[in-house]
């Protein structure tokens, strides 16, 4: 649960954040798990700890392994693990899958490619961007802060994009590269005021106390790729994340589907171990885009036990 994969290339800088958070956090100690040897905090070391961050300046293949971080406070200590793999630089242009960060999608209207992990580093603009190892040139490409913007995106713009920047540590510079795939979504289409397919307005959903329940909010927004479209759940008019009930969670990420060519999104609300008080809440399925917002309200009711007749 408190473990995170991190990777980098030899002779580049790699900075890893402790996957465990402490509230509050006073100090963070780092250890090399295999030997239980403490990672030094002195910056003269090639590998050193700096609070929540573990820094490899630069990284070596031999640094690969599991690192333990312990977040300390007067009350409790919390432990996390960083699984670090450092790879040799490839001689050819191909970036292997194991070095790729998550794929991003873009369209004619929205074509931002964020440089992965850059927020961990002390870097200064501009970023350098490469596509399939070729430096990007031309007015269509704009390096802005930590992302690349491509104007008038075309299907040919799909591919592997590498950002390259310099991390500065006490006057010394270290190179960092990170690569992710970019896919282009078809833009032929239109958008319309959201149409909520489920739930029906003022629907009463029967649930069993003590059992788990799922509510699906599903809405369509037009045809083709949609810019700024979302579905979400609210409880008593409050965002799920702000409501503070761990049993009630939205499914991470929105599932996109195309129903009769329409672009639709759905969001599942999962209620674990339904309680009496859940029946008193108002559940709102919200669908919004640039045209506006539509809301359907659901309430829960207790499912009566089924009568069994012989």
């Amino acid at each position: 649960k408190f473990s995170k994969q991190s990777w980098g290339l030899e002779n580049e800088a790699l900075i890893v954040r402790c996957p465990r958070q402490g509230k509050p956090s006073y100090t963070v100690d780092w250890y090399y798990s295999q030997t239980n040897k403490s990672i030094p905090t002195q910056e003269r070391n090639r590998v050193f700890a700096s609070g929540q961050l573990l820094k490899f300046l630069p990284a070596a293949v031999a640094d690969s392994g599991i690192y333990t971080c312990i977040v300390r406070s007067p009350t409790f200590n919390r432990t996390g693990y960083a699984n670090v793999t450092i790879y040799k630089k490839q001689s050819d242009c191909n970036v292997p899958d194991y070095l790729m960060y998550s794929t991003v999608s873009g369209s004619e209207k929205n074509s931002k490619i964020y440089c992965p992990t850059i927020d961990l580093y002390n870097w200064t603009a501009p970023l350098e961007w490469f596509k399939n190892c070729q430096a990007l040139q031309g007015s269509r490409y704009r390096a802005h802060k930590s992302f690349l913007v491509i104007d008038n995106v075309m299907t040919e713009d799909a591919g592997d994009y590498t950002c390259k920047f310099i991390h500065n540590e006490n006057g010394a510079n270290y190179s960092v590269t990170a690569t992710r795939s970019f896919t282009v979504k078809d833009e032929q289409g239109f958008s319309l005021f959201p149409v909520i397919g489920a739930p029906a307005q003022n629907e009463i959903k029967e649930v069993e106390i003590g059992k788990n329940a799922n509510l699906t909010c599903s809405a369509c927004f037009g045809k083709g790729t949609q810019f700024l479209a979302a579905v979400l759940w609210q409880l008593n008019g409050t965002k799920i994340t702000d409501f503070g009930e761990p049993r009630i969670q939205q499914e991470e990420g929105q599932n996109q589907s195309f129903s009769n060519g329409l672009a639709c999104l759905d969001m599942v609300l999962r209620i674990a171990d339904v309680k009496e008080e859940d029946l008193l809440l108002q559940y709102d399925c919200l669908a919004l885009n640039l045209h506006g917002l539509r809301r359907h309200t659901v309430r829960l009711s207790r499912k009566n036990p089924i009568d069994h007749h012989s």
């Epitope: 509050p24 006073y26 007067p74 919390r78 503070g244 761990p246």
Partner: antibody, heavy 118, light 112 residues
Framework: EVQLVQSGAEVKKPGATVKISCKAS????????MHWVQQAPGKGLEWMGA????????VYAEKFQGRVTITADKSSSTAYMELSSLRSEDTAVYYC???????????WGQGTLVTVSS | DIQMTQSPSSLSASVGDRVTITCRSS???????????LYWYQQKPGKAPKLLIY???NLASGVPSRFSSSGSGTDFTLTISSLQPEDFATYYC?????????FGQGTKVEIK
């Protein structure tokens, strides 16, 4: 908005046990420690102990060790403080208080008055 | 245990006055991470304490800038630059350096 709502006032006899609840809302309950603080009438504040709701780990002040038990129910985002073998000097207002990334005692419950009287 | 000693235990002042409360700890509150774990709380009758200042000199969210705090490892000062009617309350210093966490005995600020 972060809120800590405590259970109502209690009147107990010496030797009895009291259990106070503190329901948290507006933040992720397991992300933050919950502490308990005692305030006797007209007196100052005294730290009693704390729990890490994620793991159930607890830590107590020596003064209350053996008499206090702090628990947490993740499913209802509620923390509990149980004080046993009550005596008259335990008459006090008891507060639950939550922590943030930077500091302890950031949010406070409204307090629960416990009166110990024969 | 770290002892926290406040002075005075009470004081009378008028609206607009500059008010200073001192707090002394029996041990330095300076952590190896460079942070001084000294806190100030305000409490009004029948209400829960409210965090004013954390880690020696940082104002908590929503606290007016007339409140300030300074000090070294063991001697600390809370200053209210211009006392307002809503500032009449009891003020506590506290340490969160080590367990058990301890509070000062409080300073009651009353209307003159």
């Amino acid at each position: 908005e972060v809120q800590l709502v405590q259970s109502g006032a209690e009147v107990k006899k010496p030797g009895a046990t009291v259990k106070i609840s503190c329901k948290a809302s507006g933040y992720i309950f397991i992300d933050s420690e919950m502490h308990w603080v005692q305030q006797a009438p007209g007196k100052g504040l005294e730290w009693m102990g704390a729990i890490d709701p994620e793991t159930g780990d607890t830590v107590y002040a020596e003064k209350f060790q053996g008499r206090v038990t702090i628990t947490a129910d993740k499913s209802s985002s509620t923390a509990y403080m149980e004080l046993s073998s009550l005596r008259s000097e335990d008459t006090a207002v008891y507060y639950c208080t939550g922590s943030t990334t930077d500091y302890y005692f950031a949010y406070w419950g409204q307090g629960t008055l416990v009166t110990v009287s024969s | 245990d770290i002892q926290m000693t406040q002075s005075p235990s009470s004081l009378s002042a008028s609206v607009g006055d500059r008010v200073t409360i001192t707090c002394r700890s029996s041990k330095s509150l300076l952590h190896s991470n460079g942070i001084i774990y000294l806190y100030w709380y305000q409490q009004k009758p029948g209400k829960a304490p409210k965090l004013l200042i954390y880690q020696l000199s940082n104002l908590a969210s929503g606290v007016p800038s007339r409140f300030s705090s300074s000090g070294s490892g063991t001697d600390f000062t809370l200053t209210i630059s211009s006392l307002q009617p809503e500032d009449f309350a009891t003020y506590y210093c506290a340490q969160n350096l080590e367990l058990p966490f301890t509070f000062g005995q409080g300073t009651k600020v009353e209307i003159k």
